[in-house]
């Protein structure tokens, strides 16, 4: 699949989610991603298929790519870990964590974002923040402010309707609807937020970005817990 | 520099098919959408459909269904727009564009016998 | 599908004039992208998203709307400015443009 999947949404207040992230490849946004602790982003394994040779790092405390901004700093990466049960061809167990070159400064617009350690489904209809840097509409403009979107929570068994995603959405994955708003290319590794906690991150599968049909994927970070926590320690 | 530089003019008989091709420098195409307009000599612009590069998922106004194909190879950061069945009506100018902000300089097309 | 009309088809301006053009859609949509296109040139975006001008556009230019009826305002014309201009809606497939406006200089 490739890197990305925000559609329908608008620009967010800037830098008031400071747990967000841009993974970069060779100084170019190419990927969402969430600070999960001080030396930590959580992101998506797919968005790196591609960066064999490229430079990939971490932009924080931004709200615009391109205007300075007295919060923003670009980190290395150290170390890059995706999920060892990650493919090129599936959707399943889509996620990296990226270690940064040192810990982050944190601050009022970099902050890391409590995660859900639970493993038990959010409620369908649950309104969740996702937000990012990808395309904003369907000529594919990419912008350069952060932008975001509320998405309702959608049940699995819609999810998973042979019209939807027929059958791919394993109890590790979670759906919101996709009706004209959706996160779409180049949100993927993004933050799924409810409540203030961060619940899941977009998957970077082939997908239709807005349509109902077709409904937003997200990897549901508390299945991950096990994970999470044997690679942050 | 963003450029977009589309193949040279193309003569073609009625019937036959032609395939024109658009290569992408100073981005990469995965990270947008890709589009074909048409302009007719004298005409408006007319909008044949988009591909997103990064999965090959093309969309196509219905009524160029069946007459256009839009495809991609991200290896040569090229998009491409094949035209089958060709007629007159299909003498047009044809332009290639990264989400509709940057555009190719347009390639020729004439029908002919 | 949508159709989008533009008028007037013809618009003559003399320099330092205001302009505007109009762009009617035949249902709601939810914004548009604004296009001039010189002869023997291609197309160039100049407003994306009913309001925001595009990269290098001068501020002389700027659009507005919403629903069915939308407008591209020159705040002074100048030469340079006489182009066909194409309005174009990306709420609803098939993505339709409108037959244009076409500015002449007086």
């Known amino acids: 699949p490739p890197r990305g999947r925000i559609l329908g949404g608008r620009e967010a207040e800037a830098h008031a989610r400071p747990y967000m992230a841009s993974v970069q490849l060779n100084g170019a946004h190419l990927c969402g991603g969430v600070l999960v602790a001080e030396q930590w982003v959580l992101s998506a394994a797919h968005c790196l298929e591609d960066a064999a040779d490229g430079k990939v790092q971490v932009l924080l405390g931004a709200h615009s790519l391109s205007q300075p901004e007295p919060s923003k700093r670009l980190y290395d990466v150290l170390r890059a870990v995706p999920h060892p049960d990650s493919q090129p061809d599936t959707i399943d167990h889509d996620l990296l964590l990226l270690q940064l070159s040192e810990k982050a400064t944190l601050g009022p617009a970099v902050r890391p974002l409590p995660w859900q350690r639970v493993d038990r489904d959010v409620a369908p209809g649950t309104l969740c923040d996702v937000a990012g840097w990808g395309i904003v509409n369907h000529a594919g403009r990419r912008p350069d402010s952060l932008q975001h979107v509320l998405l309702p929570v959608l049940d699995r068994a819609t999810c998973n309707r042979r019209t939807h995603h027929d059958g791919a959405i394993t109890e590790r994955l979670m759906c919101a609807e996709s009706n004209r708003r959706d996160s779409c290319k180049g949100d993927s590794g993004g933050p799924l937020v409810c409540g203030g906690v961060l619940e899941g991150v977009v998957t970077s599968g082939s997908r239709v970005c807005g349509n109902r049909k077709k409904p937003g994927i997200y990897t549901r970070v508390a299945s991950y817990a096990a994970w999470i926590d044997s690679v942050l320690a | 520099e963003v450029q977009l530089q589309q193949s040279g003019a193309e003569l073609v008989k009625p019937g036959a098919s032609v395939k024109l091709s658009c290569t992408a420098s100073?981005?990469?195409?995965?990270?947008?959408?890709m589009h074909w307009v048409k302009q007719r000599p004298e005409q408006g612009l007319e909008w044949i459909g988009r591909?997103?590069?990064?999965?090959?998922?093309?969309e196509y106004d219905p009524k160029f269904q069946g007459k256009a194909t839009i495809t991609a190879d991200t290896s040569s950061n090229t998009a491409y727009l094949q035209l089958s069945s060709l007629t007159s009506e299909d003498s047009a100018a044809y332009y290639c564009?990264?989400?509709?902000?940057?555009w190719g300089q347009g390639t020729s097309v004439t029908v002919s016998s | 599908q949508i159709v989008l009309t533009q008028s007037p088809a013809i618009l003559s301006a003399s320099p330092g004039e205001k302009v505007t053009m109009t762009c009617s859609a035949s249902s709601s949509v939810s914004y548009i992208y604004w296009y001039q296109q010189k002869p023997r040139s291609s197309p160039r975006l100049l407003i994306y998203?009913?309001?925001n001008l595009a990269s290098g556009v001068p501020v002389r230019f700027s659009g507005s709307g919403s629903g069915t009826s939308y407008s591209l305002t020159i705040s002074r014309m100048e030469a340079e400015d006489a182009a066909t201009y194409y309005c174009?809606?990306?709420?609803?497939?098939?993505?339709?443009f409108g037959g244009g406006t076409k500015l002449e200089v007086k």
């Open positions: 100073g981005f990469n195409i995965k990270d947008t959408y």
């Open positions: 564009t990264s989400a509709m902000e940057f």
């Open positions: 174009q809606q990306w709420s609803s497939y098939p993505f339709t």
């Open positions: 591909i997103d590069p990064a999965n090959g998922y093309t």
């Open positions: 998203d009913t309001s």
